[in-house]
Interface confidence: medium
Amino acid sequence: ELCDDDPPEIPHATFKAMAYKEGTMLNCECKRGFRRIKSGSLYMLCTGNSSHSSWDNQCQCTSSATRNTTKQVTPQPEEQKERKTTEMQSPMQPVDQASLPGHCREPPPWENEATERIYHFVVGQMVYYQCVQGYRALHRGPAESVCKMTHGKTRWTQPQLICTGEMETSQFPGEEKPQASPEGRPESETSCLVTTTDFQIQTEMAATMETSIFTTEYQ
């Protein structure tokens, strides 16, 4: 079952999954100037049995420079912020992760992948929080959040973490050294699908005359 929303946001903190439950997916995104290969997978899927889990499919990116319909654009301020705050980190692997049944490790990077990783989490997924560089953790309880199913709806538990502005960093479980994380959301951020009962789409149509026609593709 999909988690309907994102893990909670904690000011001056990022979250990270140490392992990904079976059913989790990672979008195959390519960095600017590259695109997925023709008939390439849209995503990787964590699958497996009781003894072994792994990521099905492989993400592959190829250069889109040869396309004459490609136009380079400057990201909007919102996009610039998003890319800045979701740059890829070195994978943080706790020592016992490989022995966690029904879970996959952090997928290895693929060539020319995007700086942002979008995951789709499933019920039972746990994420861990740490304060960003320059902030210190004050723990009132677990610095983690779990996606749970309650009365047919999914929700994330609230992590008990406060980050204060002192020059000291905390660590994810299993890490030997502190990781410097950019402020904002990490690469493991996901926006799972929201419930659809109050979601509507309307279309409007207009036929227009154009003398010069061009196609722009943002890849």
Epitope: L2, M25, N27, E29, R36, S39, G40, S41, L42, Y43, L45, T47, D56, N57, V73, P75, E78, E79, E82, E116, I118, H120, E189, T190, S191, C192, L193, V194, T196, D198, F199, Q200, I201, E217, Y218, Q219
Partner: antibody
């Protein structure tokens, strides 16, 4: 002169800027099956059906919470009902617009 | 492109019948298959995603199975509101492709 078809899909009940899904256009000629035109991520990245790619542009307007389709050089073969939809990747297209009937006549 | 071959193209059935619609993919697409129902004048409605997971709000008489290249949508105990056209769709690779559809009408 050639004509360009322009369709806009207004999204309510959620932000089009949220990550984790894409926004699709699909069409259905009268009495026929469904044909995927393309989709756009919230970031602006697009993927188009190769059969239509030279004529298609999909864009997103975050300020208006809507996304649009432009199909250039339309002919009678482009007559169809055009749908917009929210695509949850592996999880299917779970929210659809009501559809717009487009008739191209010579 | 991945071709989705859907059979039969049409079938006649009665209320209470068990109906099965199959979709064959031209290559291995794991479980990246979704099923939709469409009634005349309406937009398609997602029934099943990931080959076998029931979309929220969809009656449990609908079920999906299969993986790899062969997939089946089954309707147990057909109801009057189930007479419609059904489509399979692969979301493994772009371009995303649909089956040709199966029209289910009253016998």
């Amino acid at each position: 002169p050639s004509q360009t078809l322009s369709l806009t899909c207004a999204v309510s009940g959620g932000s089009i800027s949220s990550g984790g899904y894409s926004w699709s256009w699909i069409r259905q000629p009268p009495g026929k099956g469904l044909e995927w035109i393309g989709y756009i991520y919230h970031s602006g990245s697009t993927y188009y059906n190769p059969s239509l790619k030279s004529r298609v542009t999909i864009s997103v307007d975050r300020s208006k919470n809507q996304f649009s389709l432009k199909l250039s050089s339309v002919t009678a073969a482009d007559t169809a009902v055009y749908y917009c939809a929210r695509a949850g990747y592996y999880y299917g297209m779970d929210v659809w617009g009501q559809g717009t009937t487009v008739t191209v006549s010579s | 492109d991945i071709v989705m071959t859907q059979t039969p193209s049409s079938l006649s059935a009665s209320v209470g019948d068990r109906v099965a619609i199959t979709c064959q993919a031209s290559r291995n697409i794991w479980s990246y298959v979704n099923w939709y129902q469409q009634k005349p004048g309406e937009a398609p409605r997602l029934l099943i995603y990931g080959a076998s997971t029931l979309q929220r709000g969809v009656p449990s008489r609908f079920s999906g199975s299969g993986s790899g290249t062969g997939f089946t949508l089954t309707i147990n105990s057909l109801q009057p509101e189930d007479f419609a056209t059904y489509f399979c769709q692969q979301s493994h690779s772009t371009p995303i492709t649909f089956g040709g559809g199966t029209r289910v009408d009253i016998k």
